[in-house]
């Protein structure tokens, strides 16, 4: 983790925490994430098919950043959503969302980030995901595109 | 601190926390920060030559905002990085990064912010810094440009 | 809360926390917020006339996101501020602020978000508010525009 091994966790420090980074072989929605290598954290939360699975009800700070870029700007509308799914409920619930329109000069190389972060009351078995409107415009560098949470 | 003196800290509340604000009279990288006056916080973490020095291993939420602005837009590529250095490791590690290209209308007065924030497992003696691609375009108002962290 | 009722809070979990969402009948500054329905949280903090009222001195992470959009871009300068007011002090204190200028192509439909988040030492009876420069350009969807905090 960050260039050095994790310290042995103290008993009290079994924090519910995750920090997942961009995975460039994502081909479909929701986005998939690197959950093993690099500056990744995953403790007391499970990762399954793009989603963070809550296993303890409580308050969580949830965040995500997505880095969009392209070779030639055509101002395709961009959206970045963090949403929640639970088998007890029929519909996805959008927790946080960012949208961009008319954000670059036509024809130019462009780059832009979207950041989301807030507190939510989550229930055991909730699955959290990230969705974007245009996968081909996402850059998946670990420092640029990420998804995480921690239990307060 | 925010217009009123800090309360006497309770014994349990020796929180590892920092909130540093922009310091305008510097031309060096990494960015230097105001660590004394205004809405600054620094407790259980040291500040040294632009860096926050971790003295207790654990999980930290780290954040930074930088406010870029200019009088006449030429779309100079902008980057904003939070990176980590530790004497045991040869290379800086970029923890979070934001980039902007083609973000304003040529010739116009412009302004834009970059925000970064995420959880990391940090080790005692890690030094955290903020870097930008163009110092001349940063505005250092305390409410606009800042760097902070807290131990979970 | 997020599509399912809150669990009965455990004794220890009386967290000071708030997450308020956009309220479209805001007509004046500061912004007003939805404090009851949807993905709202309000515990150990009071909501009063657009403001979050602190009732326990300590360290808080405070955040806000505002979603601006318009039908026809004229690059009206945008600002988004989180500020603090306390009856003991004569003036509002701007804690965090984001500004945008020259951010879209003249005449086009446009959309952009501003995100702020940082740690502050707050005192009992502090009132926190959000201000924007142009209310008519704010979209108040609950996932897009919000204001929150939690005590560390």
């Amino acid at each position: 983790q960050i260039g050095h091994p994790s310290p042995p966790p103290e008993k009290k420090e079994l924090r519910k925490v995750a920090h997942l980074t961009g995975k460039s072989n994502s081909r479909s929605m929701p986005l998939e994430w690197e959950d093993t290598y690099g500056i990744v954290l995953l403790s007391g939360v499970k990762y399954k098919k793009g989603g963070l699975v809550i296993n303890e009800t409580g308050l969580y700070f949830v965040y995500s950043k997505v880095y969009f870029r392209g070779q030639s700007c055509n101002n395709l509308p961009l959206s970045h959503k963090v949403y929640m799914r639970n088998s007890k409920y029929p519909q996805d619930l959008v927790m946080m969302e960012g949208k961009m329109m008319s954000y670059c000069t036509t024809g130019q190389m462009w780059a832009r980030s979207s950041y989301l972060g807030a507190v939510f009351n989550l229930t055991s078995a909730d699955h959290l995901y990230v969705n974007v409107s245009e996968l081909s415009l996402v850059n998946f560098e670990e420092s640029q595109t990420f998804f995480g949470l921690y239990k307060l | 601190q925010i217009g009123h003196p800090s309360p006497p800290p309770e014994k349990k509340e020796l929180r590892k926390v920092a909130h540093l604000t922009g310091k305008s009279n510097s031309r060096s990288m990494p960015l230097e920060w105001e660590d004394t006056y205004g809405i600054v916080l620094l407790s259980g973490v040291k500040y040294k030559k632009g860096g926050l020095v971790i003295n207790e291993t654990g999980l930290y939420f780290v954040y930074s905002k930088v406010y870029f602005r200019g009088q006449s837009c030429n779309n100079l590529p902008l980057s904003h990085k939070v990176y980590m250095r530790n004497s045991k490791y040869p290379q800086d590690l970029v923890m979070m990064e934001g980039k902007m290209m083609s973000y304003c209308t040529t010739g116009q007065m412009w302004a834009r912010s970059s925000y970064l924030g995420a959880v990391f497992n940090l080790t005692s003696a890690d030094h955290l810094y903020v870097n930008v691609s163009e110092l001349s375009l940063v505005n250092f108002e305390e409410s606009q440009t800042f760097f902070g962290l807290y131990k979970l | 809360q997020i599509g399912h009722p809150s669990p009965p809070p455990e004794k220890k979990e009386l967290r000071k926390v708030a997450h308020l969402t956009g309220k479209s009948n805001s007509r004046s500054m500061p912004l007003e917020w939805e404090d009851t329905y949807g993905i709202v949280l309000l515990s150990g903090v009071k909501y009063k006339k657009g403001g979050l009222v602190i009732n326990e001195t300590g360290l808080y992470f405070v955040y806000s996101k505002v979603y601006f959009r318009g039908q026809s871009c004229n690059n009206l300068p945008l600002s988004h501020k989180v500020y603090m007011r306390n009856s003991k002090y004569p003036q509002d204190l701007v804690m965090m602020e984001g500004k945008m200028m020259s951010y879209c192509t003249t005449g086009q439909m446009w959309a952009r978000s501003s995100y702020l988040g940082a740690v502050f030492n707050l005192t009992s009876a502090d009132h926190l508010y959000v201000n924007v420069s142009e209310l008519s350009l704010v979209n108040f969807e609950e996932s897009q525009t919000f204001f929150g905090l939690y005590k560390l």
Epitope: - | S26, M29, P77, E134, L135, S136 | -
Partner: antibody, heavy 119, light 111 residues
């Protein structure tokens, strides 16, 4: 509008010193470097050094150490370059230019001051 | 010091045609983020004017017929289509390290 207005032409004798000025306007003087560049007759461009008006820090090209001294007056938004122990080799056009701190490109230039060193 | 070598020293190009100027650095002037090469135009009796920064970015107000490319040690300035007013001397400059240095210049004549 960003402008750099340089002082007029100078004719000085060998061995003397001269102080050239560059008055900046239209931007925040303390947020950008001011660089100085020499151009000898029919020759290319040589970077002399920069000064950061924010804190007065300077950096010189080794070839000009001891020859050039850079200073600023923040109150008037003026940068100065003093050249000492002048010889005919110092005859040139001297430009000041605003330079971005990190990218270090020269995005606005003064009109130039012609220095002639002759007895 | 990083030495920048421009070629050719001079060239003559017909109106409407393409002018290509090369700038070679004695060592790399690129990082993982940017290439620290800038291009200037200078006309007689006037100061230089910034055209291209960071190898490929067009300065505000500069016509789109100017373009820059390259990375590492090899960089190119292209002008297409060349116009009468482009007759000038062109310089590359690096800002990868101190001291900043300029290329020797390329004089463009319009035929």
């Amino acid at each position: 509008e960003v402008q750099l207005q340089q002082s007029g032409p100078e004719l000085v004798k060998p061995g003397a010193s001269v102080k050239l000025s560059c008055k900046a306007s239209g931007y925040t003087f303390t947020r950008f470097d001011i660089s100085w560049v020499r151009q000898r007759p029919e020759q290319g461009l040589e970077w002399i050094g920069w000064i950061f008006p924010g804190d007065g820090s300077t950096q010189y090209n080794e070839n000009f150490k001891g020859k050039a001294t850079l200073t600023t007056d923040k109150s008037s938004g003026t940068a100065y370059m003093q050249l000492n122990r002048l010889t005919s080799e110092d005859s040139a056009v001297y430009f000041c230019a605003r330079s971005l701190i990190s990218t270090a490109m020269f995005d606005h230039w003064g009109q130039g001051t012609t220095l002639t060193v002759s007895s | 010091d990083i030495v920048l070598t421009q070629s050719p020293a001079s060239l003559a190009v017909s109106l409407g045609q393409r002018a290509t100027i090369s700038c070679r650095a004695s060592k790399s002037v690129s990082t993982s983020d940017f290439s620290y090469i800038h291009w200037y135009q200078q006309k007689p009796g006037l100061p230089p004017k910034l055209l291209i920064f960071l190898a490929s970015h067009l300065e505000s107000g500069v016509p789109a017929r100017f373009s820059g490319s390259g990375s590492g040690t090899d960089f190119t300035l292209n002008i297409h289509p060349v116009e009468e007013e482009d007759a000038a001397t062109y310089y590359c400059q690096h800002s990868r390290e101190l001291p900043r240095t300029f290329g020797g210049g390329t004089k463009l004549e319009i035929k």
